[in-house]
Amino acid sequence: TIDTKRNISAEEGGSVILQCHFSSDTAEVTQVDWKQQDQLLAIYSVDLGWHVASVFSDRVVPGPSLGLTFQSLTMNDTGEYFCTYHTYPGGIYKGRIFLKVQESS
């Protein structure tokens, strides 16, 4: 199963950690996809390492663990984020996070 904070908030110009936790006694994680709506943010592959989409490469840092640190947030970053865990032999598991970027006080 995937466990995640469903709703998170952060300040404009700040950073936030996007984190999904996968728990299984038998399945091994082989790949994790991170998307902002339908746009690819980053992919982690156990065989290749991290690939960060070029459009986000200056603002997205892999980690901690299989999560992402999203930096220099703008109001336009408000929205849904999805993690997709590819596991063997367990199949595919998805998680959803809603990020609200608030104006800095």
Partner: antibody
Framework: QVQLVESGGGVVQPGRSLRLSCAAS????????MHWVRQAPGKGLEWVAV????????YYADSVEGRFTISRDNSKNTLYLQMNSLRAEDTALYYC????????????WGQGTMVTVSS | DIQLTQSPSSVSASVGDRVTITCRAS??????LAWYQQKPGKAPKLLIY???SLQSGVPSRFSGSGSGTDFTLTISSLQPEDFATYYC?????????FGGGTKVEIK
């Protein structure tokens, strides 16, 4: 024994195309990611591209993105590198290589095939 | 992309010497670093993966250490067959990248 044999290199003019092949044997090719790495004469190693076991998950070095295409035919145990719009700086010895699963090191290499881009 | 800087670019040593080669990454790469040996006219040979794990069949005089940004390859007692060029390679981020190489020459 595990073996990789590259072919298809040669002399080609700038702007032209070439397709490299890599014949694999001695291991379960269809279960392995495969990489291309190149080495310009007298220079160091440069990673070029990788392809997933099933032909998905293709990634490229910035220097070849949009010009080179990596592909594979698992029924023939063969890896390919289609090189278009070749430039003088693509002149190199091209190696195919197999990684250690999950370890991200390249443990089996071919002998290489030389590509020379010159007018 | 991650830049890997190897030092020194060349080293002269004698049989029996202890040789140390360093590799510094422009960003943290955890322990995802491999080391290769290449002899003239030959393909590279994997020595170390995961910064410190010895590849099967590689002599125990080769060892690797480090994590984050700073890594070391050590040859404890240089043998005649060890004169070659050594490369580090990171595999934390795509694209994978190699260091510029260190040539180990006979003094």
């Amino acid at each position: 024994q595990v073996q990789l044999v590259e072919s298809g290199g040669g002399v080609v003019q700038p702007g032209r195309s070439l397709r490299l092949s890599c014949a694999a044997s001695g291991f379960t090719f269809s279960s392995s990611y495969m990489h291309w790495v190149r080495q310009a004469p007298g220079k160091g190693l440069e990673w070029v591209a990788v392809i997933g076991a099933d032909g998905s998950n293709k990634y490229y070095a910035d220097s070849v993105e949009g010009r080179f295409t990596i592909s594979r035919d698992n029924s023939k145990n063969t890896l390919y590198l289609q090189m278009n719009s070749l430039r003088a700086e693509d002149t190199a010895l091209y190696y195919c290589a197999k990684p250690v699963p999950r370890r991200r090191g390249l443990d089996v290499w071919g002998q290489g095939t030389m590509v020379t881009v010159s007018s | 992309d991650i830049q890997l800087t190897q030092s020194p670019s060349s080293v002269s040593a004698s049989v029996g010497d202890r040789v140390t080669i360093t590799c510094r990454a422009s960003q943290g790469i955890s322990s995802w670093l491999a080391w290769y040996q290449q002899k003239p006219g030959k393909a590279p040979k994997l020595l170390i993966y995961g910064a410190s794990s010895l590849q099967s069949g590689v002599p125990s005089r080769f060892s690797g250490s480090g994590s984050g940004t700073d890594f070391t390859l050590t040859i404890s007692s240089l043998q005649p067959e060890d004169f070659a060029t050594y490369y580090c390679q990171q595999a934390f981020y795509l694209p994978w990248t190699f260091g510029g190489g260190t040539k180990v020459e006979i003094k």
